[in-house]
Amino acid sequence: IRAEKAMVDGSWLDLAKRSKLEAQPFAHLTINATDIPSGSHKVSLSSWYHDRGWAKISNMTFSNGKLIVNQDGFYYLYANICFRHHETSGDLATEYLQLMVYVTKTSIKIPSSHTLMKGGSTKYWSGNSEFHFYSINVGGFFKLRSGEEISIEVSNPSLLDPDQDATYFGAFKVRDID
């Protein structure tokens, strides 16, 4: 009976662990290639997939181009942005580019916006080169509260690589706030 009870307790613990793990919020969002803004100015990227290809979301919300936190906690945030240009797709307006990504947190309760991470570089992309490519990856560990929103801004959106393995961002909860 004791052994039986231990087995039941063990499986209940497993189940509890598993359901807790399943409840751990995460999101991996990939760029929506059909709705990338044009131009060279800094813009907020609002069109992302959350439920196709590599994109998935659980216990977080994607709304109005922003990833919304549903549970307080410490989260690992990441973003990967690829820029590319091939001469067959047109000309570059300028050969001197600042290729940047900004990961921003917005709080609704106290309306404010903070850049959590930024990355990028100034680049010389000669008009005489057939193909150009540049990738930025940023990641960090942040305390996030329920209702806070994460968004992505980039420069030169017309140069974004639209593939799901190239331009994406995400988050996953690592632990609770004590």
Epitope: S38, G39, T88, S89, G90, D91, A93, N128, S129, E130
Partner: antibody, heavy 118, light 111 residues
Framework: QVQLVQSGAELKKPGASVKLSCKAS????????LQWVRQAPGQGLEWMGA????????KYTQKFKDRFTITADKSKSTAYMQLNSLKSEDSAVYYC???????????WGQGTLVTVSA | NIVLTQSPASLAVSLGQRATISCRAS??????????MHWYQQRPGQPPTLLIY???NLESGVPVRFSGSGSRTDFTLTIDPVEADDAATYYC?????????FGGGTKLEIK
């Protein structure tokens, strides 16, 4: 298919200005440099300058810089070139043109004849 | 500015023979492993048409009788065999460096 349609012939007096237009179709107007090339009667081709219609960036040959302006109206997919203080030696056929998908000028307007005469 | 010098200024070639036109640049027009030299044909009263791009690539729809070669400062357009329809003026052009420049032209006459 890519098409560049230019405005009609112009007869101008020395010292006057001329403004020519070039309407583009068949491609995204804002993603290629649009060039202007001229050819005086019986002479060779002379590259004058270009515009990138998106942000309106321009580049000019030094020779024309002071009296030559290229502009674009994105809403009309049309580029314009204005040449001021005309001289008789500005009499020429003026072409607008665009590069091909690789390189080289693959697309040309039909040309606009500008005659400068007293 | 890069100066392009074409030679000869004019040439007469018999039907079915080979025509060779040379273009020499005052400095190299090569960069990123490519030669930014192009060749055009122009008939009277018409805009030019692109024949060869990047020194040796045949533009779509251009007969294989036309070919281009060369690198850095010395380039050649070859027409072999020449046909009656090839009577025109031929221009080289570089777009390696602003301002883009054209050669002075070569007038081809068919004998």
């Amino acid at each position: 298919q890519v098409q560049l349609v230019q405005s009609g012939a112009e007869l101008k007096k020395p010292g006057a200005s001329v403004k020519l237009s070039c309407k583009a179709s068949g491609y995204t107007f804002t993603t290629y440099w649009l060039q202007w090339v001229r050819q005086a009667p019986g002479q060779g081709l002379e590259w004058m300058g270009a515009i990138y219609p998106g942000p309106g960036n321009t580049k000019y040959t030094q020779k024309f810089k002071d009296r030559f302006t290229i502009t674009a109206d994105k809403s009309k997919s049309t580029a314009y070139m204005q040449l001021n203080s005309l001289k008789s030696e500005d009499s020429a056929v003026y072409y607008c043109a665009r590069r091909g998908s690789r390189r080289g000028i693959a697309y040309w307007g039909q040309g606009t004849l500008v005659t400068v005469s007293a | 500015n890069i100066v392009l010098t074409q030679s000869p200024a004019s040439l007469a070639v018999s039907l079915g023979q080979r025509a060779t036109i040379s273009c020499r640049a005052s400095e190299s027009v090569d960069s990123y492993g490519r030669s930014f030299m192009h060749w055009y044909q122009q008939r009277p009263g018409q805009p030019p048409t692109l024949l060869i791009y990047l020194a040796s690539n045949l533009e779509s729809g251009v007969p294989v009788r036309f070919s281009g070669s060369g690198s850095r400062t010395d380039f050649t357009l070859t027409i072999d065999p020449v046909e009656a329809d090839d009577a025109a003026t031929y221009y080289c052009q570089q777009d390696n460096e602003d301002p883009y420049t054209f050669g002075g032209g070569t007038k081809l006459e068919i004998k």
